[in-house]
Structure formats: C-alpha cells, structure tokens
C-alpha cells in the first residue's frame, strides 16, 4: 500500500550560551538563497559536534529559525542573517520551528493540519 507523510509543526524557544567555538551550527536560506521553494526562511543545516547547540541538544538539523534575540529573520539576505547570529552576543535566544514526521498512513487519509485541504 502506498503511504503519505504527515508533519507536526511545533515551535520552541531555545536559549544558548555561546561556547569557546561559538554557537556551533550552520545555516542556509535567505531571500537571495532560498533553500525551500517559496520560502526565504533561515534553516539549520548542520549541528557541529561538541558545539554549544549540540551540547544543549534541542536544536536540530532542518529546524527553521524564526527569530534571534527577538529579532525576526523574515526577508533577510543570507549574509545579513549570518551577521545577525555572529553579533548576537553571549546569551542567544532562538525561536525555532521543528517539523516532525508523525505518521505514514494510506493515501486518501488527510491528517489534521494538512496544507492540501
């Protein structure tokens, strides 16, 4: 039987303390570097081993970062977003969106929050 994937989208506030090597992750995205079609948002592309984000454990590769220290990341050039992180200070508050795969049901089933409906 063919299946389909449904996703649960959740938001979380993550407070990181900048470590000796920084925050410890990479990003993709921005108005000039769309990673997701029709979405200029900023996404986590790499969590570096033993970095601040990895040691905290909550930020995940694939998460969308909505804001940094309360500053919205919408409609930013990629390098402007990078600079925002680099200049964010010692204590950094991230508002992130997790997208979790929650089921793989049969075709024809429409889960709650299905964007197709």
């Amino acid at each position: 039987m063919n299946g389909r994937v449904d996703y649960l989208v959740t938001e979380e506030e993550i407070n990181l303390t900048r470590g000796p090597s920084g925050l410890g992750f990479n990003i993709v995205g921005g108005t000039d570097q769309q990673y997701v079609s029709n979405d200029s948002g900023i996404y986590v592309s790499r969590i570096k081993e033993n970095g601040a984000a990895a040691l905290d454990g909550r930020l995940q590769e694939g998460d969308k970062i909505l804001s940094v220290n309360g500053q919205d990341l919408k409609n930013l050039l990629h390098q402007d977003a990078v600079d925002l992180f680099r200049n964010a200070g010692y204590a950094v508050s991230l508002r992130v969106q997790h997208r979790l795969q929650v089921q793989n049901g049969p075709i024809g089933h429409r889960g709650e929050g299905d964007p197709s409906g």
Partner: nanobody, 128 residues
Framework: EVQLVESGGGLVQAGGSLRLSCAAS????????MGWFRQRPGKERDVVAT????????YYLDSVKGRFTISRDNAKNTVFLQMNSLKPEDTAVYYC??????????????????????WGQGTQVTVS
Amino acid sequence: EVQLVESGGGLVQAGGSLRLSCAASGRPFSSLDMGWFRQRPGKERDVVATINWTGDSTYYLDSVKGRFTISRDNAKNTVFLQMNSLKPEDTAVYYCAARGGGSSVDSEYDVGEFKYDYWGQGTQVTVS
C-alpha cells in the same frame, strides 16, 4: 541521520578509469556538503575531493588534480568521483562523507574544513 552507500570500486589496470558513486538518504541531499576520502594501506585517511552543497565550489588533493572529478546529482541524491589515469598509488579504500552545508554562524573560516559528520562504509579500489 544520513546514510551513505558507496559503489563502483574494483580492480583496474594502471591508466584505467573507475567511477565511484555514493547514494545518500536520511535528509535532504541538496543541503549537504559531500566529500571523497581515501585510506591507503598503513596511512591516515586523506581528503581526495569535496563539493559544497550548492555545487559551485570544489576541492581536490594536489595529486589527483586533472585526473579525478567530483560531481553531484541532487535529483538522484548521489555524488560521483570519476577517476581517470589511475596509478598504483591510488590504491585505497575510498570513503564517501557528508555534512550539512551552508554558512557557519560562528566565523568566516571554519576550522574543521575537512571535518565531516557522516561516513559510508568504504569501497576498495585496487590499481595494478
């Protein structure tokens, strides 16, 4: 978690060619930097070639420049290493590696330039 499966290794005569493939799964391939490394008998594992997530930046070990070409096919979630004019000293186990691409939020220069997070099991290349 990223899973990497290499193929295409084998035995070839000096001067011959091989094309290694590495199929990736587990997360969007288009966001991954990819690399090929090799470990020769009794030696450390060395970087051979890398390609960034957008495909517009490559790196080659000096001794393979002009002979090896790294490329990627995002539609097939696969990275390739075309190896021409093979030499006996190219004999090694070749490993595919991956890491998330993009920009570090920490500094212009990423200290772990050749530090990769995910590794395949390797494929043997023997040049006689």
